[in-house]
Interface confidence: medium
């Protein structure tokens, strides 16, 4: 058993049929010595008396809010949550496996630049009685500070018969050094509580590996005289790190016909303009990637040829 | 050229060669993103390779103030990686494919380090400890980790030279 926060405790249980469970001793936080009784949740049934209560925690029915009273007055509470371990593996029932970039990916994180700011998100099908708490650091043995906000519900989607809820959190490294080469990964830890079930999820990454620039901005076409060619121009996204002479991007320009089956023409360039042939009903798209480190490409920015 | 006296390197040449190094480092190990840090075993290897740190003066402001600190740091790292790529970790079994970019990568590391410090100029003696003998079963993982670290190192070096070529060239 360990303390998650004040008056909230997590009991770690090996979860199998007829498991013996865990013996827990609760102590009433009071100077009083006699006349103390204990109840669980809203029930008025007295579970025991005395300053301490010893219980055997085996299942969710044994978890919940234990309250000690004296003469109708509440003295203190202890909320017991369960963390299940099945076949030596902690349960992951609350969050959905996003399976990208690999199986058992529950948390996904992205950064728009090298400022030390990043966003993580996760999915669940649970709609109520759900709380999240997020902590992060750079390195684990001698951790350096990363400050995370509160996790918020950022999207709801319908998937077949189910509703899916996306939660996200923004974090910022306290003393970020955008130009340095990271040697210690960022660690992100999410505590998830659904009713009386506790689970924790972790992710470890370098900012450089989760970089995904915003799409190029101000995408414009300029037809070239007496030619089917156009000059496409764009700018670095506002959110990208500066100066651009140091934090450089490379770009992919694509000409795509109306039909998905039509051949795509692609040009790669380090410049912020390119000359391409504009076919009728086609569209021109541009995306960006860090020039020197192959992290994710941005989403496409697009304009129609006409 | 970056020499102890503090003259400038051939920024544009360094830019071109460092960008080539980035391309080679990724073609030598393109699938880097798909391996989980926590599945890689010993973290010591990552700590054993050079890193360009915050105080090394490789940020735009530090380069403007005095690029020598950063260039020396990059030079040290290039020599270090060049030695690693020439060690039995890469030359021993299992053999690399004949067309592996590791050979080109090794030569380019040497080329860029020489551009930074031509013959006859010395920042300091390059000191590198004895490498642990590695076995075939350890080498694949070591190659992966070294190449992945090298990708990060040369990305910073390439940014430095690109910025230098754009803003510090005479």
């Amino acid at each position: 058993i360990w303390e998650l926060k004040k008056d909230v405790y997590v009991v770690e249980l090996d979860w199998y049929p007829d498991a013996p469970g865990e013996m827990v001793v609760l102590t009433c936080d009071t100077p009083e010595e006699d006349g103390i009784t204990w109840t669980l949740d809203q029930s008025s049934e007295v579970l025991g008396s005395g300053k301490t209560l010893t219980i055997q925690v085996k299942e969710f029915g044994d978890a919940g809010q234990y309250t000690c009273h004296k003469g109708g007055e509440v003295l203190s509470h202890s909320l017991l949550l369960l963390h299940k371990k099945e076949d030596g593996i902690w349960s992951t029932d609350i969050l959905k496996d996003q399976k990208e970039p690999k199986n058992k990916t529950f948390l996904r994180c992205e950064a728009k630049n090298y400022s030390g700011r990043f966003t993580c998100w996760w999915l669940t099908t649970i709609s109520t009685d759900l709380t999240f708490s997020v902590k992060s650091s750079r390195g684990s043995s001698d951790p350096q500070g990363v400050t995370c906000g509160a996790a918020t519900l950022s999207a709801e989607r319908v998937r077949g018969d189910n509703k899916e809820y996306e939660y996200s959190v923004e974090c910022q490294e306290d003393s970020a050094c955008p130009a340095a080469e990271e040697s210690l990964p960022i660690e992100v830890m999410v505590d998830a509580v659904h009713k009386l079930k506790y689970e924790n999820y972790t992710s470890s990454f370098f900012i450089r590996d989760i970089i995904k620039p915003d799409p190029p901005k101000n995408l414009q076409l300029k037809p070239l005289k007496n030619s089917r060619q156009v000059e496409v121009s764009w700018e670095y996204p506002d959110t990208w790190s500066t100066p651009h002479s140091y934090f450089s991007l490379t770009f992919c320009v694509q000409v795509q016909g109306k039909s998905k089956r039509e051949k795509k023409d692609r040009v790669f360039t380090d410049k912020t303009s390119a000359t391409v042939i504009c076919r009728k009903n086609a569209s021109i798209s541009v995306r960006a990637q860090d020039r020197y480190y192959s992290s994710s490409w941005s989403e496409w920015a697009s304009v129609p040829c006409s | 050229r970056a020499v102890p006296g503090g003259s400038s390197p051939a920024w544009t040449q360094c830019q071109q060669l460092s960008q080539k190094l980035c391309t080679l480092a990724w073609s030598a190990h393109p699938l880097v993103g798909h391996m989980d840090l926590r599945e890689e075993g010993d973290e010591e290897t990552t700590n054993d390779v050079p890193h360009i740190q915050c105080g090394d003066g490789c940020d735009p402001q530090g380069l403007r103030d005095n690029s020598q600190f950063c260039l020396q740091r990059i030079h040290q790292g290039l020599i270090f990686y060049e030695k690693l790529l020439g060690s039995d970790i890469f030359t021993g079994e299992p053999s690399l494919l004949p067309d592996s970019p590791v050979g080109q990568l090794h030569a380019s590391l040497l080329g860029l380090s020489q551009l930074l410090q031509p013959e006859g100029h010395h920042w300091e003696t390059q000191q590198i400890p004895s490498l642990s003998p590695s076995q075939p079963w350890q080498r694949l993982l070591l190659r992966f980790k070294i190449l992945r670290s090298l990708q990060a190192f040369v990305a910073v070096a390439a940014r430095v030279f690109a910025h230098g070529a754009a803003t510090l060239s005479p």
């Epitope: - | 270090f80 000191q127 400890p129 004895s130 642990s132 076995q135």
Partner: antibody, heavy 120, light 113 residues
Framework: QVQLQESGPGLVKPSETLSLTCTVS????????VHWIRQPPGKGLEWIGV???????DYNPSLKSRVTISRDTSKNQFSLKLSSVTAADTAVYYC??????????????WGQGTLVTVSS | DIVMTQSPDSLAVSLGERATINCKPS????????????LAWYQQKPGQPPKLLIY???TRQSGVPDRFSGSGSGTDFTLTISSLQAEDVAVYYC?????????FGQGTKLEIK
């Protein structure tokens, strides 16, 4: 928790071969480099040699002609043999491990040591 | 071989006072690439094996009290005990693992004054 324990005869005659065993528990020996170090009574520490994770060895040049270090992975055991001993080889013999890295490490776990006296 | 010279050979310090031991290798132990110094400090009490205190010149081994600290780089290293405790009476050794053969300093005997 990694544990190392040296064992072997406490007395060896001059010109004979000293043989010691180091048994490792609490981890697979394949991920350790195991070193032998000795300490003559009342004196300092001297590195004898190492057997690397892959089974290759390196020895102190001052002892190289007389030392053999080997291992038996099935028994999680390492052995030290020092031939043609003299009274100068009387010492406490330790085995110690370092964790495999790109470069050889420091010794983080040591055995308790075994005293070997060379005397007729 | 790299020769490790420790000073002083013996040292008597009052309880609660600072103790300082030096170690000078005959060549630099600083790896210019990764900026690590391949030097460790050990404490040995009578009848016991050496115990690792500090590695990479300045990193304290887990479980070692924070009164022990290591500093220095290249060819000059120091082990400092900020406030001597009775249980710190021992012989202290430095070790280089930059090149083999690994070599130890000759040891410094620390006693209470």
């Amino acid at each position: 928790q990694v544990q190392l324990q040296e064992s072997g005869p406490g007395l060896v005659k001059p010109s004979e071969t000293l043989s010691l065993t180091c048994t490792v528990s609490g981890g697979s020996i394949i991920s350790y480099n195991v070193h032998w170090i000795r300490q003559p009574p009342g004196k300092g520490l001297e590195w004898i040699g190492v057997i690397w994770t892959g089974g290759s060895t390196d020895y102190n040049p001052s002892l190289k002609s007389r030392v053999t270090i080997s291992r038996d992975t099935s028994k999680n055991q390492f052995s030290l043999k020092l031939s043609s001993v003299t009274a100068a080889d009387t010492a406490v013999y330790y085995c110690a491990r370092d964790k495999y890295g790109l470069f050889p490490g420091y010794f983080d776990y040591w055995g308790q040591g075994t005293l070997v006296t060379v005397s007729s | 071989d790299i020769v490790m010279t420790q000073s002083p050979d013996s040292l008597a310090v009052s309880l609660g006072e600072r103790a300082t031991i030096n170690c000078k290798p005959s060549q630099s132990l600083l790896s210019s690439g990764n900026r690590k110094n391949y030097l460790a400090w050990y404490q040995q009490k009578p009848g016991q094996p050496p115990k690792l205190l500090i590695y990479y010149a300045s990193t304290r081994q887990s479980g070692v009290p924070d009164r022990f600290s290591g500093s220095g780089s290249g060819t000059d290293f120091t082990l400092t005990i900020s406030s001597l405790q009775a249980e710190d009476v021992a012989v202290y050794y430095c070790l280089q693992h930059f090149n083999y053969p690994w070599t130890f300093g000759q040891g410094t005997k620390l006693e209470i004054k």
